[in-house]
């Protein structure tokens, strides 16, 4: 045979020679040789290689520090990294989620559009006509104006978007 | 066909040299690992040392570290093995062996090495 | 080193017996393993390499299977030819190691 060039997947050259590349969640301890396969070792405790590799160290599992407001969604194994995610109230700064910040409040005259979560923040609207909010809020969507008419009654004061109607008493004298 | 070859064996004192040899045909000696299994009177298989092809890589047991040395000499199609500070527990039958895959797929005949004063 | 343990260390049966052979490593060795056959006076014979894969020309009565520290040697129905000495050989460690052997004998 002559020395390879290239290799078959999940293996690597090395000295004119293809070995096996050590499996998920264990890291490089030797190369092989022609008498011997590679030897692979599997990473400890917090630690996690997640693909086919050649690596000499294994990763340490993320720390989901709750001095940032961060709590452990899924726990890391040997072949995955820990998830981190954030308390409640809170929401990741990025994709990878290093730290949290608090859900953001709609102001009076908006109201949720979309509830905040763990990795997003919460998404407000402004109130349409017809709808109000009057309070600050990451929970509270725009409500519905009262709706004097079904209640026998008739507008005193209109509704804005961030104040109801005032309904009252229909004026009894007729021309 | 492949056939491999050893000589050198004989009767050597303890603390004495020896160096035995493996001549390779039927194959193309230089694109193949090669290397030494020894087998005492009566006992198991025990791997010496091997010698790879291409990059040449040399290795052996604990037991014979130091004092034994694989070589090859490609153009003479021969494997050797230089053998020092002989000890009685090196006494056994010495194997050449061609590697393929991580396995042993043609041996010789073996050459008797016997170390006693 | 890694140690191999063969077990039996001898074995009596007849000819048409199914055999087993067992061998176990002192770590695992994943399915790096091959299994060797000796006659008195000959040179060994290679008859499973990787665990389980026959080697060239090895009749198929012969099988091996098992990965990380237990594996096995079966031969299926046996031949007078068989009667001989069985090693296991481990390659995942350096240096490679062979079992003790198992001689297997005729009742």
């Known amino acids: 045979p002559e020395p390879p060039t290239a290799c078959r997947e999940k293996q690597y050259l090395i000295n004119s020679q293809c070995c096996s590349l050590c499996q998920p969640g264990q890291k490089l301890v030797s190369d092989c040789t022609e008498f011997t396969e590679t030897e692979c070792l599997p990473c400890g405790e917090s630690e996690f290689l997640d693909t086919w590799n050649r690596e000499t160290h294994c990763h340490q599992h993320k720390y989901c520090d709750p001095n940032l407001g961060l709590r452990v969604q899924q726990k890391g194994t040997s072949e995955t990294d820990t998830i981190c995610t954030c308390e409640e109230g809170w929401h990741c700064t990025s994709e990878a989620c290093e730290s949290c910040v608090l859900h953001r409040s709609c102001s009076p005259g908006f109201g949720v559009k979309q509830i905040a979560t763990g990795v997003s923040d919460t998404i407000c609207e402004p109130c349409p006509v017809g709808f109000f909010s009057n309070v600050s809020s990451a929970f509270e969507k725009c409500h519905p104006w009262t709706s004097c008419e079904t209640k026998d009654l008739v507008v005193q004061q209109a509704g804005t978007n961030k104040t109801d109607v005032v309904c009252g008493p229909q004026d009894r004298l007729r021309a | 066909e492949v056939q491999l070859l050893e000589s050198g064996g004989g009767l050597v004192q303890p603390g004495g040299s020896l160096r035995l040899s493996c001549a390779a045909s039927?194959?193309?000696?230089?694109?193949?690992?090669m290397s030494w299994v020894r087998q005492a009177p009566g006992k198991g298989l025990e791997w010496v040392s091997g010698i790879g092809s291409y990059g040449g890589g040399t290795y052996y047991a604990d037991s014979v570290k130091g004092r034994f040395t694989i070589s090859r000499d490609n153009s003479k199609n021969t494997l050797y093995l230089q053998m020092n500070s002989l000890r009685a527990e090196d006494t056994a039958v010495y194997y050449c062996?061609?590697?393929?895959?991580?396995?042993?797929?043609?041996w010789g005949q073996g050459t008797l090495v016997t170390v006693s004063s | 080193d890694i140690q191999m343990t063969q077990s039996p260390s001898s074995l009596s049966a007849s000819v048409g017996d199914r055999v087993t052979i067992t061998c176990r490593a002192s770590q695992s060795i994943s399915s790096y393993l091959n299994w060797y056959q000796q006659k008195p006076g000959k040179a060994p014979k290679l008859l499973i390499y990787a665990a389980s894969s026959l080697q060239s020309g090895v009749p198929s009565r012969f099988s091996g299977s098992g990965s990380g520290t237990d594996f096995t040697l079966t031969i299926s129905s046996l031949q007078p030819e068989d009667f001989a000495t069985y090693y296991c050989q481990q390659y995942g460690r350096n240096p490679p190691t062979f079992g003790q052997g198992t001689k297997l004998e005729i009742k």
């Open positions: 062996a061609r590697y393929v895959n991580f396995g042993m797929d043609y």
């Open positions: 039927g194959f193309t000696f230089s694109s193949y690992a």
